[in-house]
């Protein structure tokens, strides 16, 4: 039975050219996290494997940095980065947990940044 829940940064906004941290946190389960996949509209951004470490997709290598923790940092944001991002936690023995974050990249310098949520 899957008892865990995923907390995410929720809906966030950031300025064009800036950077943002995408963060998820799995709680209320003792399941072992074996791998976390970060995806944007079915495009793989990165994988963090518990044993083998990080893999960043080559097409995002210049603009995506691993961490903090199991999170992902997006840099040099463009308006095309606006959209849904998913953290997919693969766990044993529970299975898969998915969190959703919506990022809006604004042209204006008055973009309000969502709270930067850190893993405790």
């Amino acid at each position: 039975m899957m008892t865990g829940t995923i907390e995410t940064t929720g809906n966030i906004s950031a300025e064009k050219g800036g950077s943002i941290i995408l963060q998820c946190h799995l709680s209320s389960t003792t399941a072992q996290v074996t791998q976390v996949n970060w995806e944007q509209q079915d495009q793989l951004l990165a994988i963090c494997n518990a044993d083998l470490g990080w893999h960043i997709s080559p097409s995002f290598k210049d603009r995506v940095a691993p961490g903090p923790g199991l999170g992902l940092t997006l840099q040099s944001l463009t308006v095309n980065d606006t959209g849904e991002y998913f953290c997919i936690y693969h766990t044993y023995p529970d299975g898969t947990y998915t969190g959703r974050i919506f990022l809006e990249v604004l042209e204006s310098s008055v973009a309000e940044h969502g709270a930067r949520f850190q893993i405790p």
Partner: antibody, heavy 123, light 107 residues
Framework: QVQLVQSGAEVKKPGASVKVSCKAS????????MGWVRQAPGQGLEWMGV????????SYAQKFQGRVTMTRDTSTSTVYMELSSLRSEDTAVYYC????????????????WGQGTMVTVSS | EIVMTQSPATLSVSPGERATLSCRAS??????LAWYQQKPGQAPRHLIY???TRATGIPARFSGSGSGTEFTLTISSLQSEDFAVYYC?????????FGGGTKVEIK
């Protein structure tokens, strides 16, 4: 050309351990992760785990955790798979297989395979 | 882990005919799927990666399609050397997992 040459067939008693070797040639050994797959007689393919020959980092399938150990010797371009506490169900052909992509574990289908090593567990 | 299910288990086809093999994933693997061919007493041989891209040296009669959870391997005109067992494999989540295989036999 890429070649993966495995050690010869083994016959082991239940409870014993077996260590299978896989010698790589024809490419830069430390640039490609190596996976291990087994196949019981008349059965399908079963993923066991993977090793990064550069760093020695490993990832094992949950089923084999605690019983399998994958190591490498960069001086001889050889990877090893040791399976302990053998039981009759471990009777299978064991294959090493190279992950296609250079320098990572993704996207990594298995492009070159060893010839296989038959391990028989019998009392 | 992701469960890969292949169907049918056995496919009886006459030489020159088309063979269609199916593979289903228990959750989306996007296009992270490979196909392998195995003949008796031999190691598997890599045919397809990325669900639809043929590996080097693989004849054009082999084609792969699909994305997400449903995949197909098609052999357009079976040659005698194509009678073998075919396996699909996902490589997006560890442990990587294989389907149970489809045996293509001569009708």
């Amino acid at each position: 050309q890429v070649q993966l040459v495995q050690s010869g067939a083994e016959v082991k008693k239940p409870g014993a351990s077996v260590k299978v070797s896989c010698k790589a040639s024809g490419y830069t050994f430390t640039s490609h992760y190596m996976g291990w797959v087994r196949q019981a007689p008349g059965q399908g393919l079963e993923w066991m785990g993977v090793i990064n020959p550069s760093m020695g980092a490993t990832s094992y399938a949950q089923k084999f955790q605690g019983r399998v150990t994958m190591t490498r010797d960069t001086s001889t371009s050889t990877v090893y798979m040791e399976l302990s506490s053998l039981r009759s169900e471990d009777t299978a052909v064991y294959y090493c297989a190279r992950l296609h992509v250079s320098g990572s574990y993704y996207p990594a289908y298995l492009d070159y395979w060893g010839q296989g090593t038959m391990v028989t567990v019998s009392s | 882990e992701i469960v890969m299910t292949q169907s049918p288990a056995t496919l009886s086809v006459s030489p020159g005919e088309r063979a269609t093999l199916s593979c289903r994933a228990s959750q989306s693997v996007s296009s992270n799927l490979a196909w392998y061919q195995q003949k008796p007493g031999q190691a598997p041989r890599h045919l397809i990666y990325g669900a639809s891209t043929r590996a080097t040296g693989i004849p054009a009669r082999f084609s792969g399609s699909g994305s997400g959870t449903e995949f197909t391997l098609t052999i357009s005109s079976l040659q005698s050397e194509d009678f073998a067992v075919y396996y699909c494999q996902q490589y997006i989540v560890f442990p990587w997992t294989f389907g149970g295989g489809t045996k293509v036999e001569i009708k």
